[in-house]
């Protein structure tokens, strides 16, 4: 029987800056029961707090609801594992919500094909930004990418689309069946899910020359 | 404890290209982002780019933007600088450096460096 | 880019004294400054970072104060191992950009 090895807190997420979660890797129990507590303080506070929610993020979770998510300051945290022959503490680690954002995945996602008498046919892909970002405040700048692919290939085609939320591509091959996607990251942060896939078939005569 | 150890010391020809490797280990290398800064002899330091090993995300400095090419291997927890068109003025040290927290871009951790050497 | 300048280059101080070294953005920063110690042969060690916060286990000699523009590393009392090169860098907007050093050595 020993004391419990170093925890190390791993991830911490917020899907829009008003809320955070973080997470942590449990060291060796020692063979007893373990407890695991975070604190935490704000850079230029000693003050320190005890994790306010337990439960919310599931085992091995610190959930910070709205009233203790503050941006622009850097959260220093660390975790302690205590069972009956010891302690331990993980490395702190200093977190600052602007820069742990994941957000949903973007939403109505529709995508068309487009034959204009003058011009080259092409595919054009349309989304909206997922509902929790609030794009109009400028805290925001959310960036997409989309990925497409024939039914049976196995290689998807990306494409980087910035801020837009429609893109135009030209080069598809006729006839075939396409299942489309996209996802968005904010300008500091996560990668989102990639949105459930769409599926489109290009028409036989979709010609690209 | 955290440790940044990087590939040893290189002679290259000009025109040619180098790539230097910096293995992580006592962290979970996907949770933080890691830099590439180097330090011609008797000068300054200069960041280079970024990657986030998670997914491979990376920015680089524009200077370096078309010569510069940062990645990553989760399997190995290593991160990779390749530099390409070398050149006499990219002698230098060349230091991976870990971000300092989940956040803004201060650097923690460095590796010991890797010196290059350009001379035809 | 953001060009960040150092005076003095070099420091001339006795151990027991007050360094005070500067560091000038040429532009708005806000608070997105850090401060490395580098001794020869040496990687660079973090000191502070968001201009005034000492990283964990920096002694409490080792201070640093100003936003926007200015900013300050001010070591209290200069034991013998604080002889090095000092680098601030921005953190405010890409690419990063670090000072040219300020040397502090014994006079």
């Known amino acids: 029987q020993l004391p419990p090895g170093k925890p190390e807190i791993f991830k911490c997420r917020s899907p829009n800056k008003e809320t955070f979660t973080c997470w942590w890797r449990p060291g060796t129990d020692g063979g007893l029961p373990t407890n695991y507590s975070l604190t935490y303080h704000r850079e230029g506070e000693t003050l320190m707090h005890e994790c306010p929610d337990y439960i919310t993020g599931g085992p091995n979770s610190c959930h910070f609801g709205k009233q203790y998510t503050s941006m622009w300051r850097t959260y220093i945290m660390m975790v302690n594992a205590t069972n009956q022959m010891g302690s331990s503490f993980s490395d702190e680690l200093y977190v600052d919500v602007t820069y742990i954002v994941q957000p949903d995945p973007p939403l109505e996602l529709a995508v068309e094909v487009k034959q204009p008498e003058d011009r080259k046919p092409y595919l054009w892909i349309k989304w909206s930004p997922p509902t929790l970002i609030d794009l109009k405040t400028g805290w925001f700048t959310l960036l997409y990418e989309i990925r497409l692919k024939p039914e049976k290939a196995a290689e998807w085609e990306i494409h980087f689309a910035g801020q837009q939320t429609e893109f135009k591509i030209l080069s598809l091959h006729p006839g075939q069946k396409y299942l489309v996607q996209v996802r968005c990251k904010p300008d500091h942060g996560y990668w989102s899910a990639w949105s459930p896939a769409t599926f489109i078939q290009i028409p036989s005569d979709f010609t690209m020359n | 404890q955290v440790q940044l150890v990087q590939s040893g010391a290189e002679v290259k020809k000009p025109g040619s290209s180098v790539k230097v490797s910096c293995k992580a280990s006592?962290?979970?290398?996907?949770?933080?982002?890691m830099h590439w800064v180097r330090q011609a002899p008797g000068q300054g330091l200069e960041w280079m780019g970024e990657?986030?090993?998670?997914?491979?995300?990376?920015n680089y400095n524009q200077k370096f933007k078309d010569r510069v090419t940062i990645t990553a291997d989760k399997s190995t927890s290593t991160a990779y600088m390749e530099l390409s068109s070398l050149r006499s003025e990219d002698t230098a040290v060349y230091y991976c450096?870990?971000?300092?927290?989940?956040?803004?871009?201060?650097?923690?951790?460095w590796g010991q460096g890797t010196l290059v050497t350009v001379s035809s | 880019e953001i060009v960040m300048t150092q005076s003095p280059a070099t420091l001339s101080v006795s151990p027991g004294e007050r360094a005070t070294l500067s560091c000038k953005a040429s532009?708005?920063?806000?608070?997105?400054v850090a401060w490395y110690q580098q001794k020869p042969g040496q990687a660079p060690r973090l000191l502070i970072y968001?201009?005034?916060n000492r990283y964990t286990g920096i002694p409490a000699r080792f201070s640093g104060s100003g936003s926007g523009t200015e900013f300050t590393l001010t070591i209290s009392s200069l034991q013998s191992e604080d002889f090095a090169v000092y680098y601030c860098?921005?953190?405010?907007?890409?690419?990063?950009?670090f000072g040219g050093g300020t040397k502090v050595e014994i006079k």
């Open positions: 990657i986030d090993p998670s997914d491979s995300y990376s």
């Open positions: 860098q921005q953190y405010s907007s890409y690419p990063w950009t």
């Open positions: 968001s201009a005034s």
């Open positions: 006592g962290y979970t290398f996907t949770t933080y982002w």
């Open positions: 532009q708005y920063v806000g608070t997105a």
């Open positions: 450096a870990r971000n300092g927290g989940l956040g803004p871009a201060w650097f923690s951790y």
